[in-house]
């Protein structure tokens, strides 16, 4: 028996990716393993490779279809299991009943373009990626702004409770470059977190119009 | 403006089938999921079941799948709700309802089925 | 299945003052609870989502509240268009079930 606390986590990106990590003190390193994906009243199952992503963590992407295809509902049960091989066997390492739709994390926002750029303001949009259809608008989103000479935990979240896939930021100083993140999430599901933040959009402000009081 | 607009009040023999429309405009049918509600006057309001208009897949409460049949027209942009084998207890207002799978955000009027011999 | 159980069934309340309608799981149904107002002749309109989540178009004196398996909906200042039946719903187990309704009159 491999000795040690064991943590199984996974999220369901609305529409066909669990994302699954496993970490295992006092795991053999050398050990091939999986994640297994049962569902409940689905004709199919699905296995990824568990890859290293620290001294004693792993992690797989269970591919469930296309992209943007409804692969599971909100009544599926998922039974989820990491597999490690032992000589000719697979033990069971850790296992989970597992409901998608209360344990989601959505794919991080695309697309984020600048609408419209002044000297003291900017209108961003941006898009969501690979969420379902069954959200509605009930999504709200977070969106940060980094500054010259601060770090992005420095920055403050601003929040939008509701689906609204762009922002006005507004107090900016003229001729200034910054950078911009957003992120999002269902209102859906009692483990649901954020989902990853969009890459950074860099944007630089107008100047100030010459001997004009700004 | 969202809209949901279901077929008139009927009236059925016990053993017959009856099968509701409703036509929805304001929004992306294609993408939705349409549900099914009935109100029977001694129940109370009882989730029959949905279908996502986007694949077709159906879900159907345990206390109707047997009798119950929902489908979808994309090209009409109407979902029909059918029920078979009627006995006295069917006699409700039949609602339809646009939603996600969890709540119901959007109903249609409603539909009177009276089931007597 | 799980078992919603609205209280009162009746409640009566006169304009102006606040009502408080409860509602209670048969098991634990985390924040999957939903608030309906229907009014006589008329479909369900929705209300609250997961217990406290106002929706949009709904006025501000609507608001919900959760301690464990027990639900609460809350109208500050009832208004003559309030009085009504309410439903809430739980969406945690397939099928998903309402409760039996509280009726809101003035009294």
């Known amino acids: 028996a491999v000795n040690g606390t064991s943590q199984f986590t996974c999220f369901y990106n609305s529409r066909a990716n669990i994302s699954c990590v496993w970490s295992q003190d006092g795991a053999l390193q050398d050990t091939s393993c999986q994640v297994h994906a049962w569902p409940d009243r689905r004709r199919w199952n699905q296995t990824c490779e568990l890859l290293p992503v620290s001294q004693a963590s792993w992690a797989c992407n269970l591919i469930l279809g296309a992209p943007d295809s409804q692969k599971l509902t909100t009544v599926d049960i998922v039974t989820l299991r990491v597999l490690c091989r032992e000589g000719v066997r697979w033990r069971v390492m850790a296992i989970q009943d597992f409901k998608p739709f209360e344990n989601l994390r959505l794919m991080a926002p695309i697309s984020l373009q600048v609408v419209h750029v002044e000297t003291h303001r900017c209108n961003i949009s941006w898009e969501i990626s690979q969420a379902s259809h069954y959200f509605e608008r009930h999504l709200e989103f977070e969106a940060r702004t980094l500054s010259p000479g601060h770090t992005w935990e420095e920055a403050p979240l601003l929040t939008l409770k509701q689906k609204q896939e762009w922002i006005c930021l507004e107090t900016l100083t003229p001729d200034t470059q910054y950078e911009f993140q957003v992120r999002v999430k269902p209102l859906q599901g009692e483990f649901t977190t954020w989902s990853p933040w969009s890459q950074p959009l860099a944007f630089r402000t107008k100047p100030a119009a010459l001997g004009k009081d700004t | 403006e969202v809209q949901l607009v279901q077929s008139g009040a009927e009236v059925k023999k016990p053993g017959a089938t009856v099968k509701i429309s409703c036509k929805v405009s304001g929004f992306n049918f294609k993408d939705s999921l349409m549900h099914w509600v009935q109100q029977a006057p001694g129940k109370g309001l009882e989730w029959m079941g949905w279908?996502?208009?986007?694949?077709?897949?159906?879900e159907y409460a345990p206390g109707f799948q047997d009798r119950v049949t929902i489908t979808a027209d994309t090209s009409t942009d109407t979902a029909y709700m059918e029920l078979s084998s009627l006995r006295s207890e069917d006699t409700a207002v039949y609602y339809c309802?646009?939603?996600?799978?969890?709540?119901?955000?959007?109903w249609g009027q409603g539909t009177t089925v009276t089931v007597s011999s | 299945e799980i078992v919603m159980t609205q209280s009162p069934a009746t409640l009566s309340v006169s304009p102006g003052e606040r009502a408080t309608l409860s509602c209670r799981a048969s098991q634990i149904i985390s924040n999957n609870l939903h608030w309906y107002q229907q009014k006589p002749g008329q479909a369900p309109r929705l209300l609250i989502i997961y217990g406290l989540q106002s929706i949009s178009g709904i006025p501000a004196r609507f608001s919900g509240s959760r301690s464990g398996t027990e639900f609460t909906l809350t109208i500050s200042s009832l208004q003559s268009e309030d009085f009504a039946v309410y439903f809430c719903?739980?969406?945690?187990?397939?099928?998903?079930?309402f409760g039996q309704g509280t009726k809101l009159e003035i009294k």
């Open positions: 309802a646009r939603g996600g799978p969890w709540f119901l955000s959007y």
């Open positions: 719903q739980q969406s945690n187990n397939w099928p998903y079930t």
């Open positions: 279908i996502d208009s986007e694949n077709g897949e159906t």
